[in-house]
Each structure stands twice: as structure tokens, then as C-alpha cells.
Interface confidence: low
């Protein structure tokens, strides 16, 4: 349904508050270095313009596309060239090339200062003094640091952020009330950002078909009672929503997500019995709840898959008539029967099935050729099962911190060219799979673990893409989306790597380490561990453990010393010398 003015249409659909918030998110995700005040000014100008279009859709420029309007506005920023360099060249282009150019310049790792949380009383005062500015600042700071954050979901986070301050700033013990809520929002926010980043990478790097396959598998697990046609409709709509958000079309994305939630709730009887509670909530909570809803129970007496996909004489006929529909049906039927499998495993099985049909449907006796296709699935299923079992055992044995260290060593040896901060960040996140997933019973471990690992490895891929340094990383990241994890798992020690020159400065520590939080201190130690491995890739576990134990003792000793800085200087030299000797450097 064509509208005379797209901007008026979205303003009316979304309402002023959401319109302004989404425009702010969009601008902050594009121009990540711009000061808050500049963005607020741009948003206010766009909002005032939108209001004139609501009043008269025929007014001047109201018929322009949102990309044109927003792009024109962004290109008025005076310091574009100085702040963003070649991104300013985007402004010389016409739509749609200009928007594509802006998208290509989104930075997954912008050079922005770490967000430091002020004292609770300071935050509460700021919240009470100007609630609107306080919440806008939250949207701005998150959006610029996470340029692919799912915008409608960020509105939900902002609503919870506001609720936390509303509730806790009047609590008897503000800090006790607020801090755990903020920690929870921070952790959930990081997870949400990383999950959305994978969706956008899937769409942008592997195309719509790859995303749709992922969505078919996931929605079929979640809604196993829904008919294939229903799942297909949801997949189409969901793909549109995520394509829009990943493409910077945040107003359309939020509007379409609301429509999808409305449709799901109006048709919940034919989708899932688990949606009732979600559908009673307000819009933002409803959409979030639907996205996180637990899997419905599998229908009883589902027939064997073999009948339609192996034994039927029509397999090749069905495949030839509509390849993607038939493969989609296979994926749907397999996924709804296997909530215990990861989505990526289901996609590997579907790929194996597709490859077999491609080969066999051209053979003399197709049925004879594909009769044993399900036997090929067994090793594919057992590989992640065994890997998860081994790693959960290791996690139980070591605990999270030491498990992370084991992964740090493992991944540094696989891809030592990758920057140390990236290796630390990614390995720490990989290590969190233990506490996140190993607590689950067998039936939930694989979907939890392997799909989480896909999200984390995508972080490695997007960070590495910015400054590629390892052919092995590039290969694992680009060859196959669903085989990324097996590809990284299969990497052995990189024998071609020339060890890094020893630099004593890397292992020089100061008294400031004593005032760091436990997490930050762990990161310091893990950074040192990665550097050690880069200097001595052939170091044994025992050697590394000895050096790390000495290091921990050194930090503990000097942090207890009266003259900490002198202790770090003198004992640090001894530690470096002892470590060099222990590792044969």
C-alpha cells in the first residue's frame, strides 16, 4: 500500500516517542563518533519535518524516501570529513548507493571510551533532573557502540532501563535495587547485540536464502504444531523485518515487527500454545517475549521422516519441481522433531540432504543412490555431541576462568596472528558457554551451546574482517556459515607462525592492577597469557600453568606490599626473567 509520504506514514504508525527514538538510534549507528547534542539536534529537525508532512502529505519534500531524507540530514554534519574521513565520500553518491556506502562504514569496534557507570546517586539525580535526556543518552551510547543492535529491541531495553531507575531511585537502598538490574541489562544487551550481529552477517554475507533457512529451522523447533505454510509465512515476514533493520531501515523494521507480533497473537491457535502470556503484554514486551518464547510441545504421533524424504518414489520429482520449498519442508519436518539439535546442525543435515539429492536425482537409479542418506547424518550429529560432552567435562573440572584460559591457549595456537584484545574477548565469550549451557540436561545442551558458539565466532569474524590478518580465519568465516564452528574446531596449531619477538614491556605491570575489578584483573592476566603463547606457541600446558601461577602470586604479593609500585618494578623483572627461563625464551 503506497503512501504519499513515507515519513508521515511511519510517524503516524509509530507515534512521536518511538519515531524520535528510532531516528536517534539510526543516526547514532551511522555516525558513531558524533557528539550526543549534534544527534539530538538532527533528530529534532527530522521530527519537526515529519510533523509538517503529517499535517500535509503533499508538502515539499514529504514524498522523498526515508533514505533520502535521513541521508541528506546526515550529510549536513559539518565535521563529516574531519571525523569520518572517507565516509564523507558517501555524501557524493545518490540513493540507494549512498545508504549502502554508510552501511559499509559501520564500525563493529569503534574507537570509543569505555562506558563508566557513575555513582548511583549521581545517576538518580540525572534521571530525575531530565528523564528524557537521560534515556536518549542511553539509546545513543548503546547504538553508537553496537551499530547493528536490533532497534525495536533497544526500545524494549530502554523501557526496562527507565523502569529500573523509576523503581530503584525511590527504593530504600538504591544501589542494591539498581545495580543488579543494570548488570542484567548490560549482559542481556551484549548478548542481544551479538545475536543480532549474526543475523545481519547471515543476511549480508550469505544472503536471504541462508537467513530463511536459519529461520525455518528455528521457528519449526519453536512452533512444532504449526503447519509448514504458517511457518513459511512467519519466515517471510521475519526475514523482511531483519533485512530492514540490518539495512538501516529502522522505522520500517519496527513497524513491521509490530505487525508481525500482532499477526502471531491473532493466530496463536494455529502457531503455538505457549504464546498466551506473551500476547497479553504491551507491544515492546510482547515482541520480546515472542522472540524468546519456549518451544511448544511436539505433536504426538508424528510419522517417520523416511516415508516422505527417502522411501517415496516422488522424492526427485518433488525436489525438481520446487527445490527450495521441498528442502524447506525437509528442514521444517526435521527441526520440529528435534528441539534437541542446534539450528546449525539441522542446517548441516539439510545441506547434506540437498547435496545427496543433487547427485542422486541425476543418477541412473536415484532411489538406490539416496536410500542411505539418513546414515550420513549420524557422524554429523555425533560430532557436536562429543565436542560438547568433552568441553562440559573440562568446564566442570576447571571452572569458568580456567576453562576460558584453556580456550585462550587453544585459539591463540590456532590463529596467533589475530590481535590479542580480540583473542581475549572471543575466548572469554567462548568460555562462557560452560556456565551458560553445561547446566542444561542433554536435550537442551546442543541447541544452547552450538548456537551460542555461532554467535561468538561471528564476533571473531566481524572483528577480523575489519583488519584481516589470518587466512585461516578468513577461510573459516567465509566458506560456510553453518560450518564455521567445525572449521575452527578442526584447526590445529599454526605451524607457519613465526613467534613474536619477546618484549619485556608487554609483561610489565603496575600498581593500578590492584584497584581493578576481578573481571578486569582476569582480562589483564589473560592478555598476558595470550602474549606468552604468541612468544612461545609450542609451550606446554604445564609450562604455561607454572608461569601463570607465578604471575598470579606476583600480583597478589605486590598488591599487599606497602610500596606497591616498587614491588611491581623489582619483582616484575624477576618474574620476566624466571618466565623466560621456564619457557626457554
Amino acid at each position: 500500500d503506497a503512501h504519499k509520504s513515507e515519513v508521515a506514514h511511519r510517524f503516524k504508525d509509530l507515534g512521536e516517542e518511538n519515531f524520535k527514538a528510532l531516528v536517534l538510534i539510526a543516526f547514532a549507528q551511522y555516525l558513531q563518533q558524533c557528539p550526543f547534542e549534534d544527534h539530538v539536534k538532527l533528530v529534532n529537525e527530522v521530527t519537526e519535518f515529519a510533523k509538517t508532512c503529517v499535517a500535509d502529505e503533499s508538502a515539499e519534500n514529504c514524498d522523498k524516501s526515508l533514505h533520502t531524507l535521513f541521508g541528506d540530514k546526515l550529510c549536513t554534519v559539518a565535521t563529516l570529513r574531519e571525523t569520518y574521513g572517507e565516509m564523507a565520500d558517501c555524501c557524493a553518491k545518490q540513493e540507494p548507493e549512498r545508504n549502502e556506502c554508510f552501511l559499509q562504514h559501520k564500525d563493529d569496534n569503534p574507537n570509543l571510551p569505555r562506558l563508566v557507570r557513575p555513582e548511583v546517586d549521581v545517576m538518580c539525580t540525572a534521571f530525575h533532573d531530565n528523564e528524557e535526556t537521560f534515556l536518549k543518552k542511553y539509546l545513543y551510547e548503546i547504538a553508537r557502540r553496537h551499530p547493528y543492535f536490533y532497534a525495536p529491541e533497544l526500545l524494549f531495553f530502554a523501557k526496562r532501563y527507565k523502569a529500573a531507575f523509576t523503581e530503584c531511585c525511590q527504593a530504600a537502598d538504591k544501589a542494591a535495587c539498581l545495580l543488579p538490574k543494570l548488570d542484567e541489562l548490560r549482559d542481556e544487551g551484549k548478548a542481544s547485540s551479538a545475536k543480532q550481529r549474526l543475523k545481519c552477517a547471515s543476511l549480508q554475507k550469505f544472503g536471504e536464502r541462508a537467513f530463511k533457512a536459519w529461520a525455518v529451522a528455528r521457528l519449526s523447533q519453536r512452533f512444532p504444531k504449526a503447519e509448514f505454510a504458517e511457518v513459511s509465512k512467519l519466515v517471510t515476514d521475519l526475514t523482511k523485518v531483519h533485512t530492514e533493520c540490518c539495512h538501516g531501515d529502522l522505522l520500517e523494521c519496527a513497524d513491521d515487527r509490530a505487525d508481525l507480533a500482532k499477526y502471531i497473537c491473532e493466530n496463536q491457535d494455529s502457531i503455538s500454545s505457549k504464546l498466551k502470556e506473551c500476547c497479553e503484554k504491551p507491544l515492546l514486551e510482547k515482541s520480546h517475549c515472542i522472540a524468546e518464547v519456549e518451544n511448544d510441545e511436539m505433536p504426538a504421533d508424528l510419522p517417520s521422516l523416511a516415508a516422505d524424504f527417502v522411501e517415496s518414489k516422488d522424492v526427485c520429482k518433488n525436489y525438481a519441481e520446487a527445490k527450495d520449498v521441498f528442502l524447506g519442508m525437509f528442514l521444517y519436518e526435521y527441526a520440529r522433531r528435534h528441539p534437541d539439535y542446534s539450528v546449525v546442525l539441522l542446517l548441516r543435515l539439510a545441506k547434506t540432504y540437498e547435496t545427496t539429492l543433487e547427485k542422486c536425482c541425476a543418477a541412473a537409479d536415484p532411489h538406490e543412490c539416496y536410500a542411505k542418506v539418513f546414515d550420513e547424518f549420524k557422524p554429523l550429529v555425533e560430532e557436536p555431541q562429543n565436542l560438547i560432552k568433552q568441553n562440559c567435562e573440562l568446564f566442570e573440572q576447571l571452572g569458568e576462568y580456567k576453562f576460558q584460559n584453556a580456550l585462550l591457549v587453544r585459539y591463540t595456537k590456532k590463529v596467533p596472528q589475530v590481535s590479542t584484545p580480540t583473542l581475549v574477548e572471543v575466548s572469554r565469550n567462548l568460555g562462557k558457554v560452560g556456565s551458560k549451557c553445561c547446566k542444561h540436561p542433554e536435550a537442551k545442551r546442543m541447541p544452547c551451546a552450538e548456537d551460542y558458539l555461532s554467535v561468538v565466532l561471528n564476533q571473531l569474524c566481524v572483528l577480523h574482517e575489519k583488519t584481516p590478518v589470518s587466512d585461516r580465519v578468513t577461510k573459516c568465516c567465509t566458506e560456510s556459515l553453518v560450518n564455521r564452528r567445525p572449521c575452527f574446531s578442526a584447526l590445529e596449531v599454526d605451524e607457519t607462525y613465526v613467534p613474536k619477538e619477546f618484549n619485556a614491556e608487554t609483561f610489565t605491570f603496575h600498581a593500578d592492577i590492584c584497584t581493578l575489578s576481578e573481571k578486569e584483573r582476569q582480562i589483564k592476566k589473560q592478555t598476558a597469557l595470550v602474549e606468552l603463547v604468541k612468544h612461545k606457541p609450542k609451550a606446554t600446558k604445564e609450562q604455561l600453568k607454572a608461569v601463570m601461577d607465578d604471575f598470579a602470586a606476583f600480583v597478589e604479593k605486590c598488591c599487599k606490599a606497602d610500596d606497591k609500585e616498587t614491588c611491581f618494578a623489582e619483582e616484575g623483572k624477576k618474574l620476566v626473567a624466571a618466565s623466560q627461563a621456564a619457557l626457554g625464551l
Epitope: 523502569a163 527504593a171 544501589a175 545495580l179 543488579p180 503484554k281
Partner: antibody, heavy 120, light 113 residues
Framework: EVQLQESGGGLVQPGGSLRLSCAAS????????IHWVRQAPGKGLEWVSG????????YYADSVRGRFTISRDKAKNTLALTMNSLKSEDTAVYYC?????????????WGQGTQVTVSS | DIVMTQSPRSVTASVGEKVTINCKSS????????????LNWYQQRPGQSPRLLIY???TRESGVPDRFSGSGSTTDFTLTISSFQPEDVAVYYC?????????FGSGTRLEIK
């Protein structure tokens, strides 16, 4: 299985001090909230204090604020309640109880309790 | 501070009988962040430590028999035992987890007829 075991109770004179301990096992200690709840003889339950094991945030009931200190030792999976300037109205069975990760105001596991008697 | 008022103070029931215990908070205990009532129910059998029965007003803790149910929202809450059993003899407490101090009701003693 989650287990909480209090110790350190006893008889103490008014104005005296006592240190209660709570040993925790069977769950990831660092992620939860632990609270002290007391029950005076023949009376109901009264929340005393709580701590976030992860970041050490503490909070207290007005009746004990400034006299009692809650602390934790993450390495040893133990919690302590240091009670100073004790009064006769502090006489009670003291329980340590585990709160949730997110919804920390519901106590899903309790210890057996330790008796504190303040009397001259 | 939030004051929790429980009624009745005590109740006597026969095996199989339905038992209802009420709890009223002096102000709303609905969380602004998830719209749920932060209200819990505990059972304390004679000589034992308390045990969590219901949290978030109506969610049964795992292992709690389904004859126990919680209902209500905002400031008025109810614990219902659909069919009283001898092992249900105990004191029942409501408690708010909305804000410190996390106050308890004064308790309802449930005895067998």
C-alpha cells in the same frame, strides 16, 4: 544439591560481638545473592541483611544498620555476618538463605539456622 | 517501608479441605521492569527451616505439590491449598521482594482438626 550451613552462634552478653558464618555449596556461589534472616523465639521471620556475591553490594535492615556487617569470601564460598553492639532483641535463630540471580528477593534455599542468645 | 498484613492468624482444617490464606501489602509490589508482583510464600513446618513455596505471586517452586497455588496482584494476594494434607501443618508466611527491607507477614498457623 544446594546446601547452606550456618555456624558461629552462641551465648553473648549485651554489647558483645559474634561472627556468624555460612558455608555454601552445590551452586555457582559468585552469581547469587545471600541473605540473613532471623527468627526470635516464638516469633515470625525478619530479614536482616543481604549481599550480592558477584559485586559485593550490601544492604541492611534499619534495626541492625551500623552494628552488623555482611561480607563474603568468594574463594571459600563462605558468607559472614559480623554482629557488634549486640542487644537482647537480637536473640534469635539466624538463617542464611539464597536469593535468585535476577529476582533476588525470593529465598529458594535455607540453612538449618544457628542460635544466637544475647543475655547477661 | 512496606508492611505485610496476613490473615487469619491461625486456621484449623480437615484433611481434604480447601484452605485460603490472605496477604496484603501496604503498597504495590509490582516490579516496574517486568510487571510481575514480587510476592513470595513460605512454609515453615514445626522445628524446620522455612521453605519457598510460591514466588512472583503465582509461580510454584519446583518440587512443591500442585495443591498449593498463589494468586493476586498489586497489593492483595492469596495462598490456596486445594486439598489440605496432614504434612501441610505449618506456619505460612508471605514476603515482599520488591524493596529493602524485604518484609515478611506475621505468619498464619495452619493446624489439623
Amino acid at each position: 544439591e544446594v546446601q547452606l550451613q550456618e555456624s558461629g552462634g552462641g551465648l553473648v552478653q549485651p554489647g558483645g560481638s559474634l561472627r556468624l558464618s555460612c558455608a555454601a555449596s552445590g551452586f555457582t556461589f559468585g552469581r547469587y545473592w545471600i541473605h540473613w534472616v532471623r527468627q526470635a523465639p516464638g516469633k515470625g521471620l525478619e530479614w536482616v541483611s543481604g549481599i550480592s556475591i558477584g559485586d559485593g553490594t550490601t544492604y541492611y535492615a534499619d534495626s541492625v544498620r551500623g552494628r552488623f556487617t555482611i561480607s563474603r569470601d568468594k574463594a571459600k564460598n563462605t558468607l559472614a555476618l559480623t554482629m557488634n553492639s549486640l542487644k537482647s532483641e537480637d536473640t534469635a535463630v539466624y538463617y542464611c538463605a539464597k536469593g535468585g540471580i535476577v529476582y533476588f528477593g525470593a529465598y529458594d534455599s535455607w540453612g538449618q539456622g544457628t542460635q544466637v542468645t544475647v543475655s547477661s | 517501608d512496606i508492611v505485610m498484613t496476613q490473615s487469619p492468624r491461625s486456621v484449623t482444617a480437615s484433611v481434604g479441605e480447601k484452605v485460603t490464606i490472605n496477604c496484603k501489602s501496604s503498597q504495590s509490589v509490582v516490579s516496574g521492569s517486568n510487571q510481575k508482583s514480587l510476592l513470595n510464600w513460605y512454609q515453615q513446618r514445626p522445628g524446620q527451616s522455612p521453605r519457598l513455596l510460591i514466588y512472583l505471586a503465582s509461580t510454584r517452586e519446583s518440587g512443591v505439590p500442585d495443591r498449593f497455588s498463589g494468586s493476586g496482584s498489586t497489593t492483595d494476594f492469596t495462598l490456596t491449598i486445594s486439598s489440605f494434607q496432614p504434612e501441610d501443618v505449618a506456619v505460612y508466611y508471605c514476603q515482599q521482594g520488591y524493596g529493602t527491607p524485604f518484609s515478611f507477614g506475621s505468619g498464619t498457623r495452619l493446624e489439623i482438626k
